[in-house]
């Protein structure tokens, strides 16, 4: 059976004056030599020899300083041999327990502490946490930390509360105000021994976070300016506000706006973001003729909200603006800006000189009637197909054109004329837009099957031909209507949607012919002027081959009679 | 469980300055050990050069006090060596080794040893 | 030079005694514990015996060693080939600090 005792050891001292400071003895020593050994963590593992055994007495001594911080506690393992080196008894793990000395200081988490708080909080509003802990035995005085504030910056009224056990940073007060400081710096002690023992400090940094809670406020009692009439203005005037928010942020930020006078919409405000100043704009030209001055009411507010504390006291205040029209003799000008004539249709774009479109006259804005004393001359004139006349202000064409000119764009020619005071100087520019038709340059061609036929049998097929695609079948062949005097020779029969057969009507004597045709596509565009085809008709062989000619002089007719020679 | 591994930049040369560094994983050098720097010459014996507890008191190689510097870098739980003005006899593997040293009681001799080595680097001294 | 003095090389065949002596002087080994570590080639050292004469958990029993004054000694009985390596005695000197023994080298032979 073991006897046994262990004595509790302080760390940090010497404990050798208590040696031993545990004793294992068993009673098999009355009747044997007993040898003792001892094991375990402090004697033969790391750290290595802290204990010894007097192998005979079972005397354990310490040999050196423990820390409890490293070792709470030492188990050592006991056993009792016999001279033959076997054990007599159970080995026996004694428990040293290692006596803590408030030999730690608290240790923070952080040596500077980061938070925040809005402005104007509620008092008792959790600011932060700090943390701190101590390596010293837990759940004892010697690791109990007490935390208490020991300076403010900026000093003055205590503006925080610091919870002793907990750690916790609140607000002692509603009136933290960001205008009066923007941040606060506390010096704060974590002491162990619930406040009595080892202390150690840092820092805790609170931003105050800003609100808004303070109205922009125009800097004058009223504003004025003058501006000319028919201007516009990018920077009329410029209001200056205080706000004591934060600056650039959207507490801080104006926002400017009409109370009442800008119902026509002449002016905007706009925010310079760097200096928060107000810009008046002149947006729409002022009339003088209609308002001789204008008086706006602004006023400003935030870009964000207000807050709680202070929108119930938010009123609009209104500032007055007074803006003086300047009358500016205005001259003359074309109203509307641009005109647009069209040429009627079936005109053809070789007869188009001396056609008049019509007039185009400026007028005098202060009289709103059509000016006098003005000269008028073509400015930008593409291709030079038109002309002005200099005091009526008519406008006609002075050149024919081909219908493929490259100055017809979407069938439209456009063209500037100007408007000269004689007076001042001053020009003012309308724009011309003259619509022309299809033009039926391009019309189709008729194309005969052959050039001769016999004249025993005169019948050719005609074909239309079209160069562009302005024009689309089926196609309508028509004679031109010949001369009342003379009788009908031929006659056209329609065969499909391109092609016609040309016949006499009778037999016909050998000779040239030339014959007017009209075709006419679906859309009832027709040329201008008939096409001509040229068909001889000549003495055939029994084989059907044009033979001898027509006497050379035998008078031709015009209109499907032999033409006089080839 | 802590491990030590020592770093540094390679040969050195004459009468520069040697740095090296020891890192300790698995544990915190703010434990209870004295952080020691022991160097063995090519194919001759340990030469303890000196060790640092956290708190930065030290214990220095007398022979080469005037040469060497040892510090502890807490936050990066690592300590490094310094030693100016090498010769090539100071051509070695440079071991970082954990340490226990407890002043004994009266009557009791001092404690002095090292439990854990890191594997060691070799600097050699040449132009 | 080295303040604890070895003898530079020892060795013995498999099964044999060999014992390692370690000399120095009043401040250190006098005064103060010794320690004994063993470096296999290529290694770091390992500690072997601390407090003059105890072995850490793990070290076999072959391995004993013992202090008188200012000595001290390494004893290795029945030898093996997995303990060629070589062995240093350490201790702290109270005027110089750390100190170790020159190193010896174990040959085992045959």
């Known amino acids: 059976e073991w006897v046994k005792f262990a004595k509790p050891c302080r760390e940090g001292e010497d404990n050798s004056k208590r040696n031993p400071i545990a004793k294992i003895t068993s009673d098999y020593q009355a009747t044997q030599k007993i040898t003792y050994r001892i094991s375990g963590v402090g004697i033969d593992q790391p750290p290595f020899g802290i204990f010894v055994v007097d192998k005979n007495t079972g005397d354990i001594n310490i040999t050196a300083i423990v820390d409890r911080e490293e070792t709470p506690s030492f188990l050592i393992t006991c056993r009792a041999l016999n001279a033959q080196g076997l054990d007599v008894e159970k080995p026996l793990i004694l428990t040293v327990k290692i006596l803590d000395i408030n030999d730690n200081p608290p240790v923070f988490s952080q040596q500077i502490f980061m938070g925040e708080i809005e402005e104007n909080s509620a008092s008792n509003s959790l600011v932060m946490i700090l943390n701190a802990t101590d390596a010293d035995e837990p759940n004892h005085l010697n690791s109990k930390i007490a935390f208490k504030i020991v300076s403010q910056e900026p000093a003055g009224t205590p503006m925080f509360l610091l919870s002793r056990n907990t750690g916790e940073v609140r607000t002692l007060t509603n009136s933290l105000d960001r205008e009066q400081a923007s941040s606060y710096r506390l010096v704060v002690s974590g002491a162990d021994k619930d406040g009595e023992g080892l202390s150690t400090q840092c820092e805790c940094n609170i931003k105050v976070k800003d609100v808004n809670d303070n109205f922009p406020m125009f800097r004058d009692s009223q504003y004025s300016a003058r501006i000319e009439e028919n201007i516009l203005s990018s920077e009329l005037l410029r209001f200056q506000v205080t706000d004591l928010d934060e600056e650039y942020t959207d507490n801080w930020l104006a926002v400017y706006f009409f109370t009442s006078g800008n119902e026509g919409n002449w002016f905007e405000i706009q925010t310079d973001p760097r200096t928060n100043e107000g810009i008046l704009k002149v947006v729409k030209a002022l009339d003088y003729e209609q308002l001789q001055s204008v008086k706006l009411s602004i006023a400003v507010k935030n870009k964000a909200e207000f807050h709680q504390s202070v929108i119930s006291r938010y009123r609009v205040q209104s500032t007055p603006v007074t803006i003086q029209v300047i009358n500016v003799r205005e001259g003359i000008a074309f109203r509307p800006a641009s005109k647009t004539f069209t040429v009627q249709k079936g005109i053809s774009s070789k007869k188009l000189v001396d056609y008049i479109l019509g007039t185009y006259q400026a007028i005098d804005e202060d009289t709103n009637k059509a000016a006098s004393n003005v000269k008028y001359v073509m400015g930008r004139n593409d291709g030079g197909y038109l002309m002005i006349d200099s005091k009526t202000a008519e406008i006609k064409f002075v050149k024919n054109m081909n219908r493929d000119s490259t100055f017809i764009v979407n069938k439209t020619i456009t063209a500037e004329v100007l408007a000269i005071d004689e007076y001042t100087g001053k020009t003012s520019t309308g724009t011309v837009y003259v619509r022309v038709p299809d033009f039926n340059d391009n019309c189709p061609t008729a194309v005969l099957e052959k050039d001769a036929v016999c004249s025993s049998s005169p019948s050719v097929v005609v074909s239309a031909r079209t160069l562009n695609n302005r024009y689309t079948g089926p196609y309508t062949f028509a004679l031109e209507d010949q001369p009342v005097k003379l009788p009908a020779v031929w006659s056209i029969t329609t065969l499909n949607a391109t092609s016609a057969l040309l016949r006499a009507q009778e037999q016909i004597p050998p000779g040239v012919y030339h014959i007017s045709l009209v075709l006419t596509d679906s859309q009832n565009n027709r040329c201008e002027m008939p096409r001509s085809l040229t068909l001889e008709v000549c003495q055939c062989d029994n084989r059907g081959i044009c033979g001898t000619s027509y006497p050379t002089t035998s008078p031709g007719t015009r209109y499907g009679r032999p033409h006089s020679g080839r | 469980q802590v491990q030590l591994q020592e770093s540094g930049p390679g040969p050195v040369k004459p009468s520069g300055t040697l740095s090296l560094t020891c890192g300790v994983s698995g544990g915190s050098i703010s434990s209870n050990h004295w952080w020691t720097w022991v160097r063995q010459p090519p194919g001759k014996g340990l030469e303890w050069i000196g060790e640092?507890?956290?708190?930065?008191?030290?214990f220095l190689n007398p022979s080469l006090k005037s040469r060497v510097t040892i510090s502890v870098d807490k936050s990066n739980n690592q300590f490094s060596l310094k030693l100016t003005s090498v010769t090539a006899a100071d051509t070695a593997v440079y071991y970082c080794?954990?340490?226990?040293?407890?002043?004994?009681?009266?009557?009791?001799?001092?404690?002095?040893?090292?439990?854990?080595w890191g594997r060691g680097t070799l600097v050699s001294v040449s132009s | 030079q080295s303040v604890l003095t070895q003898p530079p090389s020892v060795s013995g065949t498999p099964g044999q005694r060999v014992t390692i002596s370690c000399s120095g002087s009043s401040s250190h080994i006098g005064s103060n514990y010794v320690y004994w570590y063993q470096q296999l080639p290529g290694t770091a050292p390992k500690i072997l015996i601390y407090?003059?004469?105890q072995r850490p958990a793990g070290v076999p029993d072959r391995f004993s060693a013992s202090k008188s004054g200012t000595s001290a000694s390494l004893a290795i009985s029945g030898l093996r080939s997995e303990d060629e390596a070589d062995y240093y005695c350490a201790a702290w000197d109270d005027g110089q600090g750390g100190v170790f023994g020159g190193g010896t080298k174990l040959t085992v032979l045959g």
């Open positions: 640092i507890y956290h708190n930065g008191s030290t």
């Open positions: 407090s003059n004469d």
């Open positions: 080794a954990r340490g226990w040293h407890r002043t004994g009681f009266r009557g009791y001799p001092s404690h002095w040893y090292f439990d854990l």
